[in-house]
Amino acid sequence: RPSFSLVEDTTLEPEEPPTKYQISQPEVYVAAPGESLEVRCLLKDAAVISWTKDGVHLGPNNRTVLIGEYLQIKGATPRDSGLYACTASRTVDSETWYFMVNVTDAISSGDDEDDTDGAEDFVSENSNNKRAPYWTNTEKMEKRLHAVPAANTVKFRCPAGGNPMPTMRWLKNGKEFKQEHRIGGYKVRNQHWSLIMESVVPSDKGNYTCVVENEYGSINHTYHLDVVERSPHRPILQAGLPANASTVVGGDVEFVCKVYSDAQPHIQWIKHVEKNGSKYGPDGLPYLKVLKAAGVNTTDKEIEVLYIRNVTFEDAGEYTCLAGNSIGISFHSAWLTVLPAPGREKEITASPDYLE
């Protein structure tokens, strides 16, 4: 299943994009566990200062002290690591300064498996402070497997810092990734630490490794790309089915539901029923009765048709074909109208033509 749905479900789609931190190389402060850390907000004319950690408001507690333009963390722990920001609110504008805190007692290795960034005496990084490469946000790199539908575009990113500023190169399946290795080549934006491959095809599947290095060290990170030739989707139900139907009392009727699904679907026929004269429960959800569901001995063709024999007035109402798979659920509904029988004759109105 792709790690993203190409088009979000409207009900889940955020009204605004998630906050993105637009920093290439924030100040970095490093401390060992148990040490205390003090950082001064480097903003001028800061009348009112507010603090955040990883985008969440930061308030004082038994280990965090906020005094004026200073942030103090007593007895630092690895959980204190993250992206901090101080925002100075002025009458006409506001300004934000970002910095990283790394609380670690391990020297960073060539790969990023341990998610650590090197033990140093905590000092602000500046031009005199040489530093091996480090990832600016290891959490965002934790998801390594990415499935993308064919014909779409993938962007791999490995934002890093270091002093001097590291360089970046890319490998595919452990070997140098050259433009001629794929039709249309690829694009790199070093300032965004990104690799873009347009219109991916199955041959693009594989491991992509960014190698970030300067004279003080090298780190690397590997993403696995899977190219899905068809987007997995929830079941698709044929338009217009099931169709509304009507019959007389004592007659027979059938509802048809055509289901298309790449993943194995589970199909149910459901009747909307009344309980104590109400169609809806106290929670506002409708009362439902499962009439037919796929079982061990039921074929797909059998489950796609719901037969109702010897119809009574109680059978009138709304019927729903519900199909679900590992990706989601789809359903279509139709109404059954039951008419009184004229005399003794059992007359059935012409059933709808189900073929399109």
């Epitope: 792709p2 790690s3 993203f4 749905s5 190409l6 088009v7 979000e8 479900d9 409207t10 789609e13 955020p14 009204e15 605004e16 994009p17 998630p18 906050t19 993105k20 637009q22 965002k140 790199m141 998801k143 990415h146 993308v148 539908p149 064919a150 014909a151 779409n152 575009t153 993938v154 962007k155 791999f156 990113r157 490995c158 934002p159 934006r189 965004h192 990104s194 873009i196 219109s199 993403y223 899905v228 030739e229 068809r230 987007s231 997995p232 989707h233 929830r234 698709i236 990706i327 989601g328 789809s330």
Partner: antibody
Framework: EVQLVESGGGLVQPGGSLRLSCAAS????????ISWVRQAPGKGLEWVGR????????NYADSVKGRFTISADTSKNTAYLQMNSLRAEDTAVYYC????????????????????WGQGTLVTVSS | DIQMTQSPSSLSASVGDRVTITCRAS??????LAWYKQKPGKAPKLLIY???FLYSGVPSRFSGSGSGTDFTLTISSLQPEDFATYYC?????????FGQGTKVEIK
């Protein structure tokens, strides 16, 4: 070669309905999406909505939500824009555009890009 | 909704000129910004996606830059076929929104 051809435009009275079609060819239909964008006479572009052709999911602009429905028939490689309860302000040239996703694996969001566009079809809502 | 504001609304330039159009988003859209070119009576054409990536087949005189809220489209040396209206569009927030357009006219 990727091609998108719209049809179905015309003159309709306020409150009326119209269905636009967008016939696509030259790309794997179910892997990408189709967006509808409109342009009122002498005005700028306005995004109307989008469908993903693989799973049928849809998104709409608030201005058309509840009135317009985007669908697709994958067997015919055709997307549709069903427009109901039409208003004078819906008068515009309607374009369909192939829409693909740029999957950002770091910030975990998808950027939508419309790379191929149809020629457009004019819808006029007037009494 | 995220508002996209382009400036200028129109400009006059000569063939060979360097032209810069700016686009400002009302909130952070990261690099999820595309630029389109539209000639009168024609459909728009994609020029730039992800703020700075040139779409396949687009001449290299076009370039894009920026991230967050401020973006720029630059045409390094204006050609006769570049006289058109240019639109920016953010494509991460819902709904997708376009700028009002910048018309590039012949001086």
């Amino acid at each position: 070669e990727v091609q998108l051809v719209e049809s179905g435009g015309g003159l309709v009275q306020p409150g009326g309905s119209l269905r636009l079609s967008c016939a696509a060819s030259g790309f794997p239909f179910t892997s990408t999406g189709i967006s509808w964008v409109r342009q009122a006479p002498g005005k700028g572009l306005e995004w109307v909505g989008r469908t993903h052709l693989g799973d049928g999911s849809t998104n709409y602009a608030d201005s058309v939500k509840g009135r317009f429905t985007i669908s697709a028939d994958t067997s015919k490689n055709t997307a549709y824009l069903q427009m109901n309860s039409l208003r004078a302000e819906d008068t515009a040239v309607y374009y369909c555009a192939r829409t693909y996703g740029i999957y950002d694996t770091y910030d975990m969001y998808t950027e939508y890009v419309m790379d191929y566009w149809g020629q457009g079809t004019l819808v006029t809502v007037s009494s | 909704d995220i508002q996209m504001t382009q400036s200028p609304s129109s400009l006059s330039a000569s063939v060979g000129d360097r032209v810069t159009i700016t686009c400002r988003a009302s909130q952070d859209v990261d690099t999820s910004l595309a630029w389109y070119k539209q000639k009168p009576g024609k459909a728009p054409k994609l020029l730039i996606y992800s703020a700075s990536f040139l779409y396949s087949g687009v001449p290299s005189r076009f370039s894009g830059s920026g991230s967050g809220t401020d973006f720029t489209l630059t045409i390094s040396s204006l050609q006769p076929e570049d006289f058109a209206t240019y639109y920016c569009q953010q494509s991460t927030g819902h709904p997708q929104t376009f700028g009002q357009g910048t018309k590039v006219e012949i001086k």
